[in-house]
C-alpha cells in the first residue's frame, strides 16, 4: 500500500514494483505505442523474423500445455491521493519466446474494460528470450469517479491472464449524496430533513445549521436526520459535512410555512348572456400549498335589494367559471376566493357585471286569422304580450305559417316590426289547412310561440265570404 502524498506526481519508472527485465542492455530503446485499443501491436522489429508478440519457434498445441505459467508481475496494491492530483501506475509481464499468439494488454476498472479516452501507453522490450511488456496508465486531475480497482488483462495462447488489482482511493472533502430539500410545512408541525455525505476519507460527521446558527452541538455520523419540532416562520437550513480533509456545506434550503392563499386578481367578465356570466381570474399566491378549489360569490348589485349571496364552487383550474341561472338585464356583484389546505383566501375585490336582456317569456295573445278570399290573403291579428323589463325592448314578431294539403307540406315564416299587431300573408296553397303561430322578438331573442291556430283554405271560388279562426288550440274553424 501507500499514501496519497507518496504517489502524487510520481514518475512512471518509479512505479514499477515488479522486476524490470534485467537482461535488457542499457542502451536498448523500447518500442512504445499509445494504448487506445486492446489489440494494438508493436511496430515490426529489425533483426527478427516474427512480430514481438508471437513466440518463436512454433510449438504444437500439445507442447503448449507444458509451457511454464506466465503471470503479471506484482505491483503497487493501493494508491491513496487527493482529488485533482495526477496519478500514474503500471502493470508488467514477461512473455518467453515459447509462447504463441499473445494479444495486447487491456485495462479494466471494477470489472469493466476501459475503452476510448483513457491515457495508457504500452511499451515492448524484446530480446532473444522473449518480450517484456509494460502497460502504463495515467489519470490527470483525479476525481472521485476515478476511485476503484484497476487491473490488466492479456490473452496468451488463448488463455486470459489477469493482474493483481491496483486500488485507487481518491480522498477529498466530503461529498453530498443526499442534501436537505426545500419543503413547505404547516405551522408548528414537526418535519424531518436528511443529509448524507461520504468520503473518503471516512468518517463524515454532520452539523446542522438553521438561519446561520448551528443546531447540534455534537456532530452526528453521516447520514443524519434532523427532526424539527415545528416552525412559526420561514427558515433556512443547511448541513455541514466534516472529514479529515475539511468541510463541505450543503445548499441552503428554504422551509416555508403554509399560509392561506392570496386572493385572486384580475377578475374579468369574458362574456354575458341574458342568464349567464362567464368570469375569469388569475389565482393569487398559493400560500405554499396547492389551491384545491375556488368559490365565486354573486349577489344582486342593486343597493336597495336584500338578495342574499349565491355561492358557486368550482375546481381551482381552469381559472374560469360560467355563472348560470341569473336574471336577465340585471346587475351583479361578483368576487372570487380560492382555498388551499390551510383555508380560504380573502375574496377578490368585488366587480360589477350585467346580464343582457332576455327573450320574451310569453307569447302574443288573442290570435285571429281571417281569409280575405278576394285578395287571396290571410289577415292575422293579435294582442301584444306583457313583456317584462328584463325581457328587453320589443323589436317585432315572427309568424310561422304551415300549409298542408294532400301530398303537399310547406313551412314558412315572416318577421314583422313591432308597429301594430296585425299582418297579411298571401295564400300559398288552396284546398289546404294553414296553421299559424306567432312569437314576440326582443334583442334578447325570440320568445315562445303561441298555441297554433288552424284555418281551412278552400278551393278557388267555393265561398264568397271570409272564413275566420279563433285561438282554440288544435281546433280547425272553417265557415
Amino acid at each position: 500500500g501507500g499514501t496519497a502524498e507518496k504517489w502524487e506526481e510520481t514518475e512512471l519508472d518509479q512505479l514499477f514494483s515488479g522486476p524490470l527485465p534485467g537482461r535488457l542492455p542499457v542502451n536498448h530503446r523500447p518500442f512504445s505505442a499509445p494504448h487506445s485499443s486492446r489489440d494494438q501491436l508493436p511496430p515490426p522489429q529489425t533483426g527478427r523474423s516474427h512480430p514481438a508478440h508471437t513466440a518463436a519457434p512454433q510449438v504444437t498445441s500439445t507442447a503448449s500445455k507444458l509451457l511454464p505459467p506466465v503471470a503479471f508481475n506484482h505491483t503497487i496494491g493501493h494508491i491513496v491521493l487527493s482529488e485533482h492530483k495526477n496519478v500514474k501506475f503500471n502493470c508488467s509481464i514477461n512473455i518467453p519466446n515459447t509462447y504463441q499468439e499473445t494479444a495486447g494488454i487491456s485495462w479494466w476498472k471494477d470489472g469493466k474494460e476501459l475503452l476510448g479516452a483513457h491515457h495508457s501507453i504500452t511499451q515492448f522490450y524484446p530480446d532473444e528470450e522473449g518480450v517484456s511488456i509494460i502497460a502504463l496508465f495515467s489519470i490527470a486531475s483525479v476525481q472521485r469517479s476515478d476511485n476503484g480497482s484497476y487491473f490488466c488483462k492479456m490473452k496468451v495462447n488463448n488463455r486470459e491472464i489477469v493482474s493483481d488489482p491496483i486500488y485507487v482511493e481518491v480522498q477529498g472533502l466530503p461529498y453530498f449524496i443526499k442534501q436537505p430539500e426545500s419543503v413547505n410545512v404547516t405551522r408548528n408541525t414537526a418535519f424531518n430533513l436528511t443529509c448524507q455525505a461520504v468520503g473518503p476519507p471516512e468518517p463524515v460527521n454532520i452539523f446542522w445549521v438553521q438561519n446561520s446558527s448551528r443546531v447540534n452541538e455534537k456532530p452526528e455520523r453521516s447520514p443524519s436526520v434532523l427532526t424539527v419540532p415545528g416552525l412559526t416562520e420561514t427558515a433556512v437550513f443547511s448541513c455541514e459535512a466534516h472529514n479529515d480533509k475539511g468541510l463541505t456545506v450543503s445548499k441552503g434550503v428554504h422551509i416555508n410555512i403554509k399560509v392561506i392563499p392570496s386572493p385572486p386578481t384580475e377578475v374579468h367578465i369574458l362574456n354575458s348572456t341574458a342568464h349567464s356570466i362567464l368570469v375569469s381570474w388569475v389565482p393569487g399566491f398559493d400560500g405554499y400549498s396547492p389551491l384545491q378549489n375556488c368559490s365565486i360569490q354573486v349577489k344582486e348589485a342593486d343597493r336597495l335589494s336584500n338578495g342574499s349571496v349565491m355561492v358557486f364552487n368550482t375546481s381551482a383550474s381552469p381559472h374560469l367559471y360560467e355563472i348560470q341561472q341569473l336574471q336577465a338585464l340585471a346587475n351583479y356583484s361578483i368576487a372570487v376566493s380560492c382555498r388551499n389546505e390551510i383555508g380560504w383566501s380573502a375574496v377578490s375585490p368585488w366587480i360589477l357585471a350585467s346580464t343582457t336582456e332576455g327573450a320574451p317569456s310569453v307569447a302574443p295573445l288573442n290570435i285571429t286569422v281571417f281569409l280575405n278570399e278576394s285578395n287571396n290573403i290571410l289577415d292575422i291579428r293579435w294582442t301584444k304580450p306583457p313583456i317584462k323589463r328584463q325581457d328587453g325592448e320589443l323589436v317585432g314578431y315572427r309568424i310561422s305559417h304551415v300549409w298542408e294539403s294532400a301530398g303537399t307540406y310547406k313551412e314558412l315564416s315572416e318577421e314583422v316590426s313591432q308597429n301594430g299587431s296585425w299582418a297579411q300573408i298571401p295564400v300559398q296553397i288552396h284546398n289546404a289547412t294553414c296553421t299559424v303561430r306567432i312569437a314576440a322578438i326582443t334583442k334578447g331573442g325570440i320568445g315562445p310561440f303561441s298555441e297554433p291556430v288552424n284555418i281551412i283554405i278552400p278551393e278557388h271560388s267555393k265561398v264568397d265570404y271570409a272564413p275566420s279562426s279563433t285561438p282554440a288550440p288544435g281546433n280547425t274553424d272553417s265557415m
Epitope: T265, W344, P349, L352
Partner: antibody, heavy 116, light 111 residues
C-alpha cells in the same frame, strides 16, 4: 337600515393589545366583506384590510400585516379587529365599513390612544 | 399599489359656484366597462360618507348637485351649486385591486 356599531374610546399602554368590535345589523352579515380603515388625527384614510364572513378569508395591507388581525363571529354578526404591540404611531380612529364597491355604511369609529 | 393623487389640497369656493376636485390614479382602475373609483365626504368628528360610487353613480340620498366623471385615469368630483353644508374634506378611493387606497384629501371651504 344598515348599522355598524363600534365600541367607545380605548386608552392602552405601549406594547399592549386592543380588540375593537363592530356589530352589524340591518342586513345579512355574511353577504358583505367587513373592511377596516385607520385615520390618524388630521390625516387621510388608510385601508387596513378586510374579512369575508362567508368563508373567513382575510386580506391585509402590507403595512398592517402582523399589526392587525381580523376575525368575525357570525352568530352575533360581529366583526373584530385586534391590534397588537401598540405604539404611539397606532394612536388613531379606527372605522369598520361594509365592503362593496364603495363603502356605503361606516361605523362611528373607535378612538384608540396609546400612552404610557 | 395604485397611488391616488388628489388635487387641490384645499379649495375655497363662493356659495352657489362650482367646486371641482380631481383625483388621478397611477394606473387604470377600470375593468369590464366599470371604473372602481368612489368619492367620500367627511366632516369633523364623523365617519366618511359615500357620495359617488363607480366613478359616476350617485349614492342614494345624496343631492344631485354632486356628480362624478372620468377621463382615462383622471377622475373628477363636481359640486354645483355649492352650499354651505358642503364644507368638508373630500376623498377619492379605489377598489380595483388590493390594497385599496385613498387620496390625500381636499378640504373645501365656502365663502
Amino acid at each position: 337600515e344598515v348599522q355598524l356599531q363600534q365600541s367607545g374610546p380605548e386608552l392602552v399602554k405601549p406594547g399592549a393589545s386592543v380588540r375593537i368590535p363592530c356589530k352589524a345589523s340591518g342586513y345579512t352579515f355574511s353577504d358583505y366583506n367587513m373592511d377596516w380603515v385607520k385615520q390618524s388625527h388630521g390625516k387621510s384614510l388608510e385601508w387596513i384590510g378586510n374579512i369575508n364572513p362567508n368563508i373567513g378569508g382575510t386580506i391585509y395591507s402590507q403595512k398592517f400585516k402582523g399589526k392587525a388581525t381580523l376575525t368575525v363571529d357570525k352568530s352575533s354578526s360581529t366583526a373584530y379587529m385586534e391590534l397588537r404591540s401598540l405604539t404611539s404611531e397606532d394612536t388613531a380612529v379606527y372605522y369598520c365599513a361594509r365592503g362593496d364597491y364603495g363603502f356605503a355604511s361606516w361605523g362611528q369609529g373607535t378612538l384608540v390612544t396609546v400612552s404610557a | 399599489d395604485i397611488v391616488l393623487t388628489q388635487s387641490p389640497a384645499s379649495l375655497t369656493v363662493s356659495l352657489g359656484q362650482r367646486a371641482t376636485i380631481s383625483c388621478r390614479a397611477s394606473r387604470s382602475v377600470s375593468t369590464s366597462g366599470y371604473s372602481y373609483m368612489h368619492w367620500y365626504q367627511q366632516k369633523p368628528g364623523q365617519p366618511p360618507k359615500l357620495l359617488i360610487y363607480l366613478a359616476s353613480n350617485l349614492e342614494s340620498g345624496v343631492p344631485a348637485r354632486f356628480s362624478g366623471s372620468r377621463s382615462g385615469t383622471d377622475f373628477t368630483l363636481n359640486i354645483h351649486p355649492v352650499e354651505e353644508e358642503d364644507a368638508a374634506t373630500y376623498y377619492c378611493q379605489h377598489s380595483r385591486e388590493y390594497p385599496f387606497t385613498f387620496g390625500s384629501g381636499t378640504k373645501l371651504e365656502i365663502k
